[in-house]
């Protein structure tokens, strides 16, 4: 902390300019007027400050504003929002989408610190649920933001957020993530017709149950395997052979390469060996003809 | 980066000196570049400096209107004219360079520094 000292003789700052950085740290402190500082903070950004004499104008700051800074100085920050700890960062009260996108950009670039990631708490928690405009915001900084979330954060996300999540957003999503986002995007999406539904749902099939697969298979949607692989493996197994030959399309073929790995190994030994053969991949593992299968889950569920 | 001063001596009191401030193997762009000096005993204090955005020049009061500061950005140099030189102007004077490095602050670099003795 810098030493209280009186302000020499001509010093004394009438505004906040570029002169200030030629100040020593005890000048700055005894010079510069903390709410002549708050009124100028926008001024701060142009100015190239040393990590030390920036020290001193938070210093200032705080003491002006002990039970926190109101947003109006919030949103000038610039450079010094990089100073704050996420325990400043708890005080405040931001409610501007712009204040937010004015401090996401000072840290363009970089992982998301301890002190965005406190900032974007306390602005959701104050928004009360992620609203597109937010997450639209928040994905064009962090693309990996959503996935990032808990499901029961996840969960406050309201299907008309989902217009905003590009394909590369979900990237890191787990399963469980999905199993969350995927009914709020079929949500979302159910008023777009079939292709450009496939399109859009894509990226969030990871979450879809047996059904919604079954549906897509009668609807000629050409499913890459990329996207197959990271389907739920609970989900593709009930899928029969004619079934996933519909939901692929031209893309069958790729299931040879991936016969080794869930789902499709898990999936092809389910599967009548007679009925893989149809699709005349090679594909080995299946049921041999002439066995029984029992389905013991339909079994435990009518006992 | 490396500043190099030059152009101190000893000098008679009302007497001028020009000192000269070269600086080398620049990273980032420089914001401002000035003179502060030293005296036995005494803190360091800034003496005048130049930014070279709007060519604007600072000095300490104890200075103003005897020294003189300019300099040329895209030489990377920086001179201080000082003319009626007082016994009180004796110290060594250091060069600084303030380079712009936002979004995350500012560096401060500074010479070797050249002894001005006026008698």
């Known amino acids: 902390e810098v030493e209280k000292t009186a302000c020499p003789s001509g010093k004394k700052a009438r505004e906040i300019d570029e002169s200030l950085i030629f100040y020593k740290k005890w000048e700055l402190e005894a010079c510069v007027d903390a709410a002549l500082l708050a009124t100028q903070m926008d001024r701060v950004n142009a100015i190239p400050f040393t990590y030390e004499q920036l020290d001193v104008l938070k210093h200032k700051l705080d003491e002006l504003y002990p039970q926190g800074y109101p947003e109006s100085v919030i949103q000038h920050l610039g450079y010094l929002f990089l100073k704050m700890s996420p325990e400043d960062i708890r005080k405040w009260n931001v409610t501007s989408l712009e204040t937010l996108k004015a401090l996401l950009e000072v840290n363009k670039g970089h992982e998301m610190s301890p002190q965005v990631a406190t900032l974007i708490d306390r602005f959701v928690k104050g928004r009360g649920q992620l609203d597109k405009d937010t997450l639209d915001t928040l994905t064009a900084f962090y693309p990996g933001y959503l996935c990032s979330l808990s499901p029961e954060e996840l969960s406050s996300v309201p299907p008309s957020s989902i217009w905003a999540v590009r394909p590369q957003d979900l990237d890191t999503c787990d399963p469980r993530q999905l199993d969350v986002l995927y009914p709020k995007a079929r949500l979302a999406f159910q008023n777009m017709n079939g292709s450009e539904y496939f399109v859009k749902i894509q990226s969030f099939l990871g979450g879809a149950p047996t059904e919604d697969l079954k549906a897509l298979s009668q609807q000629n949607v050409s499913m890459d395997l990329a996207t197959f692989m990271k389907l739920r493996t609970d989900a593709v197994l009930p899928l029969t052979v004619a079934e996933v030959q519909k939901l692929l399309g031209p893309h069958v073929e790729g299931l040879k390469a991936e016969e080794r790995h869930r789902p499709v190994r898990d999936w092809i030994l389910r599967q009548r060996q007679d009925d893989l053969d149809t699709l005349g991949l090679g594909l080995q593992g299946g049921i041999p003809n002439g066995y029984l299968v029992l389905d013991l889950s339909m079994q435990e569920a009518l006992s | 980066v490396q500043l190099v001063e030059s152009g101190g001596g000893l000098v008679q009191a009302g007497g001028s000196l020009r000192l000269s401030c070269a600086a080398s193997g620049r990273t980032f762009s420089s914001y401002a570049m000035g003179w502060f000096r030293q005296s036995p005993g005494k803190e360091r204090e800034f003496v005048a400096a130049?930014?070279?955005?709007?060519?604007?020049?600072y000095y300490a009061d104890s200075v103003k209107g005897r020294f003189t500061i300019s300099g040329d950005n895209a030489k990377n140099t920086v001179y201080l004219q000082m003319n009626s030189l007082k016994p009180e102007d004796t110290a060594v004077y250091i060069c600084?360079?303030?380079?712009?490095?936002?979004?995350?602050?500012?560096?401060?670099?500074w010479g070797q520094g050249t002894s001005v003795t006026v008698s």
């Open positions: 130049i930014s070279w955005s709007g060519g604007n020049t």
């Open positions: 600084n360079e303030r380079t712009t490095v936002l979004p995350t602050g500012a560096m401060d670099y």
